[in-house]
Amino acid sequence: MSRSNRQKEYKCGDLVFAKMKGYPHWPARIDEMPEAAVKSTANKYQVFFFGTHETAFLGPKDLFPYEESKEKFGKPNKRKGFSEGLWEIENNPTVKASGYQSSQKKSCVEEPEPEPEAAEGDGDKKGNAEGSSDEEGKLVIDEPAKEKNEKGALKRRAGDLLEDSPKRPKEAENPEGEEKEAATLEVERPLPMEVEKNSTPSEPGSGRGPPQEEEEEEDEEEEATKEDAEAPGIRDHESL
């Protein structure tokens, strides 16, 4: 699959699964075309990650068409932001991070604002809404979850997100983009160098981007467990 995938060309707005080292294939959208004049991003697309609302530059070999690949890569997993991303790519594919400013390269054409009346029961799955708000979250990502923690860790879901856990920092979710988030979540590290320097701020309370590979082996288990406790996409037992 990857061989034919290398030849694939994408256009703005295309939905894909994007692969970064240490990350699962992540639901994403092509936001900008390659700019040949800029050496560092030549032949690389700017990709917007659903769920985390972060961006990165990736080459076509790391991009996989969404519709063709969703059976293979579209299984929910416990990475922070991943399952929210699966929901967004299906239900809200034009979502933009708050404070999002596209650079003046070959970016996607702005779509007109939709009519305010959506279909009954909010049944219109594909809309053209563009978010707009003042908040800008800090860019942080989480560590990879280790396979040994897979079983028994999938315990947090909507309605069970605020379980009391000594390992969950009280301010793990910080919508105002303050510095304390970086201090609180020390296990989280910035995205790899390929990520755009002025990349899109993640949304308040969002899961973090596709996680980077672990750097310190001895802390793996403890940190993965901590991550599980913090992750909005991981369900826990009802405490009430």
């Epitope: 299984k75 929910p76 399952s83 929210e84 699966l86 929901w87 967004e88 239900n91 708050s98 029961g121 909010d122 049944g123 978010g131 708000s133 908040e135 879901r157 909507a158 309605g159 069970d160 997100l161 605020l162 379980e163 009280k170 793990a172 979710e173 919508p175 949304e203 308040p204 309370g205 969002s206 899961g207 909005p232 996409g233 369900r235 405490s239 009430l240």
Partner: antibody
Framework: QITLKESGPTLVKPTQTLTLTCTFS??????????VAWIRQPPGKALEWLAT???????RYNPSLKSRLTITKDTSKNQVVLTMTNMDPVDTATYYC????????????WGQGTLVTVSS | DIQMTQSPSSLSASLGDRVTISCRAS??????LNWYQQKPGKAPKLLIY???RLHSGVPSRFSGSGSGTDYSLTISSLQPEDIATYYC????????FGQGTKLEIK
């Protein structure tokens, strides 16, 4: 296209048991991450969440109504059933079912609602 | 239980006005907050999820913000079709809605 539709009696007597059915299309309750919730709204009042059932049969109930509620699903029929015992006139409301995703998103798809009146 | 308190309970504003509706949770809900719009005789519609993300098809004049226990929904320029009742909803511990804010034209 995701659609949900509630059905059941429009009138029940006090002390009786209400049984409501939510029939949906466009998704499956056998799909990982999917849930269906029931929410009600008395005339002129606020929304009140009642119960949620997940694809894996993990259920949640409103604590103040838990003893009266049961939520079940029939995956093959694409249906979720809510039963509410010992109905009282204060339970008169429009009852909605809605689809929910396992993770951090809202009730994105709702049925049109069905008005249930409790009266003798 | 987590209680959600909206203010004001009703609000009159002129077309073109900037309108803000507040929602306070009885405990920190870590941004697990949604906003819904409901028009008479209709089911609610999801407007904003995860504190500030606009749902599909929602005009960009709507925005959400907040943290901890305090959240708000803002309409930057009120339009006739925005007349409705707005509900906040937390989903951190089970699900609870605010009592609603009825928005009317002045």
């Amino acid at each position: 296209q995701i659609t949900l539709k509630e059905s059941g009696p429009t009138l029940v007597k006090p002390t009786q048991t209400l049984t409501l059915t939510c029939t949906f299309s466009g998704f499956s309750l056998s799909t990982s991450g999917i849930g269906v919730a029931w929410i009600r709204q008395p005339p002129g009042k606020a929304l009140e969440w009642l119960a949620t059932i997940w694809w894996d049969d993990d259920n949640r109930y409103n604590p103040s109504l838990k003893s009266r509620l049961t939520i079940t699903k029939d995956t093959s029929k694409n249906q979720v059933v809510l039963t509410m015992t010992n109905m009282d006139p204060v339970d008169t409301a429009t009852y909605y079912c809605a689809q929910i995703y396992d993770y951090a998103v809202g009730f994105a798809y709702w049925g049109q609602g069905t008005l249930v009146t409790v009266s003798s | 239980d987590i209680q959600m308190t909206q203010s004001p309970s009703s609000l009159s504003a002129s077309l073109g006005d900037r309108v803000t509706i507040s929602c306070r949770a009885s405990q920190d809900i870590s941004n697990y907050l949604n906003w819904y719009q409901q028009k008479p005789g209709k089911a609610p519609k999801l407007l904003i999820y995860y504190t500030s993300r606009l749902h599909s098809g929602v005009p960009s004049r709507f925005s959400g913000s907040g943290s901890g226990t305090d959240y708000s929904l803002t309409i930057s320029s009120l339009q006739p079709e925005d007349i409705a009742t707005y509900y906040c909803q937390q989903y951190g511990k089970l699900w609870t809605f605010g009592q609603g804010t009825k928005l009317e034209i002045k």
